[in-house]
């Protein structure tokens, strides 16, 4: 059976360039080790934004230099991407892999379109 991954269709980043969304997966088994990857798709090119492997019940830990942070609760991952600019507007896909125990399962979300609007510069004051 395929693993279903759900994520919101659209998210608007804050004026500070922060976007948050929930990635939820329907686990066919009792996974203890899960890897979550955020991918960006633009013009059919796919690139990795960030990735984290976590043990069920433990916190989700991205690398120190990652632009992502997140928390996990059961089969739900709350993802936050920071430092976004207008040029980063695009489709962000949540990919979930159940790494352990067997069998391995792959789940690919339909993607969240994140819109980023650069803030207008403050006008000079006299």
């Amino acid at each position: 059976k395929a693993m279903h991954v759900a994520q919101p269709a659209v998210v608007l980043a804050s004026s500070r360039g922060i976007a948050s969304f929930v990635c939820e997966y329907a686990s066919p088994g009792k996974a203890t080790e899960v890897r979550v990857t955020v991918l960006r798709q633009a013009d059919s090119q796919v690139t990795e934004v960030c990735a984290a492997t976590y043990m069920m019940g433990n916190e989700l830990t991205f690398l120190d230099d990652s632009i992502c942070t997140g928390t996990s609760s059961g089969n739900q991952v709350n993802l936050t991407i920071q430092g976004l600019r207008a040029m980063d507007t695009g489709l962000y896909i949540c990919k979930v892999e159940l790494m352990y125990p067997p069998p391995y399962y792959l789940g690919i979300g339909n993607g969240t379109q994140i819109y980023v609007i650069d803030p207008e510069p403050c006008p000079d004051s006299d």
Partner: antibody, heavy 118, light 108 residues
């Protein structure tokens, strides 16, 4: 550009061992899971084994379980396949393949031929 | 284990004709997890289609994929001389990863 180059194939007697290598270049090796796939002469493709990003998780086809061991050295950008107790049914071209971001095997090596014969 | 059955085993066609290859799964495969590969003699397989219908980089638009659930199709709209090869479907949604037995497209 992405390149996968297998080596280590050859002729080996039944019951003996062989170690295959797959040298990867042109991409960040540690960011991808990897596979070995084999193809017996004149036959179709058979998935053999999978290894996770850090090498902690490994999966094997029933036909090789207990005899083959997959491993990787991310510092050397190299994938390995240790094959023990080889039988004539293991005669095949062995390909290493990279898992693409969305799951399919997007890049393959040219293959290395393993012939098990007495 | 998901078993993939391809049909026909061999397809004899002329250049310019349309080729329709079938892949049937023993249980439901999400369309996100079905791929098609092309293999020519003496060469490694090459990814053509992933996610049931997305073309891989550099693949001409005469190749198209369709289907969902247990039935998938690869269509080559107009066969070019270089398209005569063996085609494999594959599911990659769960272990063990499995391939169909292949369909050979040969010149009539």
């Amino acid at each position: 550009q992405v390149q996968l180059v297998e080596s280590g194939g050859g002729v080996v007697q039944p019951g003996r061992s062989l170690r295959l290598s797959c040298a990867a270049s042109g991409f960040t090796f540690s960011s991808y899971t990897m596979h070995w796939v084999r193809q017996a002469p004149g036959k179709g493709l058979e998935w053999v084994t999978f290894i996770s990003y850090d090498g902690n998780n490994k999966y094997y086809a029933d036909s090789v379980k207990g005899r083959f061991t997959i491993s990787r050295d991310n510092s050397k950008n190299t994938l390995y396949l240790e094959m023990n107790d080889l039988g004539t049914e293991d005669t095949a071209i062995y390909y290493c393949a990279r898992t693409g971001w969305l799951g399919p095997f997007d890049y393959w090596g040219q293959g290395t031929l393993v012939t098990v014969s007495s | 284990e998901i078993v993939l059955t391809q049909s026909p085993g061999t397809l004899s066609l002329s250049p310019g004709e349309r080729a329709t290859l079938s892949c049937r799964a023993s249980q439901s495969v999400g369309s996100s997890y079905l791929a098609w590969y092309q293999q020519k003699p003496g060469q490694a397989p090459r990814l053509l289609i992933y996610g049931a219908f997305s073309r891989a980089t550099g693949i001409p638009d005469r190749f198209s994929g369709s289907g969902s659930g247990t039935d998938f199709t690869l269509t080559i709209s107009r066969l070019e001389p270089e398209d005569f090869a063996v085609y494999y479907c594959q599911q990659y949604g769960s272990s063990p990863w499995t391939f169909g037995q292949g369909t050979k497209v040969e010149i009539k």
